[in-house]
Interface confidence: low
Amino acid sequence: QPSVSPGEPSPPSIHPGKSDLIVRVGDEIRLLCTDPGFVKWTFEILDETNENKQNEWITEKAEATNTGKYTCTNKHGLSNSIYVFVRDPAKLFLVDRSLYGKEDNDTLVRCPLTDPEVTNYSLKGCQGKPLPKDLRFIPDPKAGIMIKSVKRAYHRLCLHCSVDQEGKSVLSEKFILKVRPAFKAVPVVSVSKASYLLREGEEFTVTCTIKDVSSSVYSTWKRENSQTKLQEKYNSWHHGDFNYERQATLTISSARVNDSGVFMCYANNTFGSANVTTTLEVVDKGFINIFPMINTTVFVNDGENVDLIVEYEAFPKPEHQQWIYMNRTFTDKWEDYPKSENESNIRYVSELHLTRLKGTEGGTYTFLVSNSDVNAAIAFNVYVNTKPEILTYDRLVNGMLQCVAAGFPEPTIDWYFCPGTEQRCSASVLPVDVQTLNSSGPPFGKLVVQSSIDSSAFKHNGTVECKAYNDVGKTSAYFNFAFKGNNKEQIHPHTLFTP
């Protein structure tokens, strides 16, 4: 017994005074604890614990299961122990078959011996299979066999404790090692959709998938900048031994505008954390926003093509689209398609293809679109540029020469006098009167201009040219006249197109 100075409490003394005691099965175990402040005996083996308040522990007929550590404790909390082996050739091992090991840690195969004098205390694989080459273990007859640094590859390994007794190998009951994987990476998290757009009252449901090596991964849905507890449902699966998947589904059964915001799926394990977010936007009602992809005022030359293109955002999805001109709906020549195939897409494109436009086809082209909540429209004003066309050219009864031309943009009419038979008319003549005839109407069709000059100003034979022109082209008409004595002869008008 350890020596102590007088007055200082000392641990109890045990008889027999040795650390280990070996008895045969059926023999008596008699242990005496001597201490003025005796409190109790405690017996421990595997998960079993027994107590005895008598200072003498007597087991009349020892059994293998009486093998274990006997501890005597006094009132000062000081204790002394003796380990008793009850040798039973028919029961060499005490076993607790539950065997769990954490990856990279040591784990104990709990198969303490009832006889410390057997040899070759070790582990063996089941059915004669060899143990993994890298498996290291340390035997301890009182505790079992410690497997060092458990590997993930040992999961579901079947093994026995083994000893040699009288030259023969004796095996314990079998153990199945269950390895709890260590987290060596952060969880993998993903979300069903990155953004959601809903109307008030609709259900919001989003699923986060968490993948890790075991179910011990922690996950939760959180609202950013909020501590409100969220209602979520879980489903989980083990796809093989170290491939765990959990689906955490967050649901708001009737979303409100103030539910809008960013929701985070957060997961962590002992290695670290990961998160993924989804954005919810709740609107009080649906909407449509139209964006013209070209100017809404369009100028196009006669005979050319033009595409009227709009992009629009529509939520909920558009139900009716149409292009209209002069109160008529186009049944073809247009197409409407989503901007993207993404499930969250709310942006669409509509194109009206106008081909070989005539001067008479200028005007307002309107795109209309509607969904279950709203209607929207956008108008394009299309102007068709046409070269001037001379509608009339005449000598009026009052002696005036009149020329009327139509085109877009508005034509300009110039007058020229050509003396004699010359074809080049260079001397310009100022008109007496110029009028735009239809300026009060909508400015989509051709504009008609009328110009007049006084023929009495001409004193010589010759030709008068009326030239109408705009940005697109020009057209001319001619008046031929001659003097006979003092009288002018009949004027003969004719036209000449000048490209």
Partner: nanobody, 121 residues
Framework: EVQLLESGGGLVQPGGSLRLSCAAS????????MSWVRQAPGKGPEWVSG????????YYADSVKGRFTISRDNSKNTLYLQMNSLRAEDTAVYYC??????????????WGRGTLVTVSS
Amino acid sequence: EVQLLESGGGLVQPGGSLRLSCAASGFTFSAYTMSWVRQAPGKGPEWVSGIGPDGFITYYADSVKGRFTISRDNSKNTLYLQMNSLRAEDTAVYYCAQGDSRSWHNSFDYWGRGTLVTVSS
């Protein structure tokens, strides 16, 4: 070594209440999701309720929703199940389990030895 020790079971009349406790040791309790699982006589195990490591998330089987409340005290390493409005069909052995598996065949990593709850008049 992980240990889970349930207590608080007993005989109670229909409509009555019980509070189960589960004392945990041998692991970092505050790091793990915990569950209650029950097994009625002659039936297979049934997952009852689960709680996240920080107690922020709780979830329940439809059969107990609104009647049972799961909670935990990480400072005491203890898991609780408050059972109200008990019915005869709640009679079972109640196990405390580590992990959040929804179906028993997935197996929990560790579980206790159970405490018996009997609901009978």
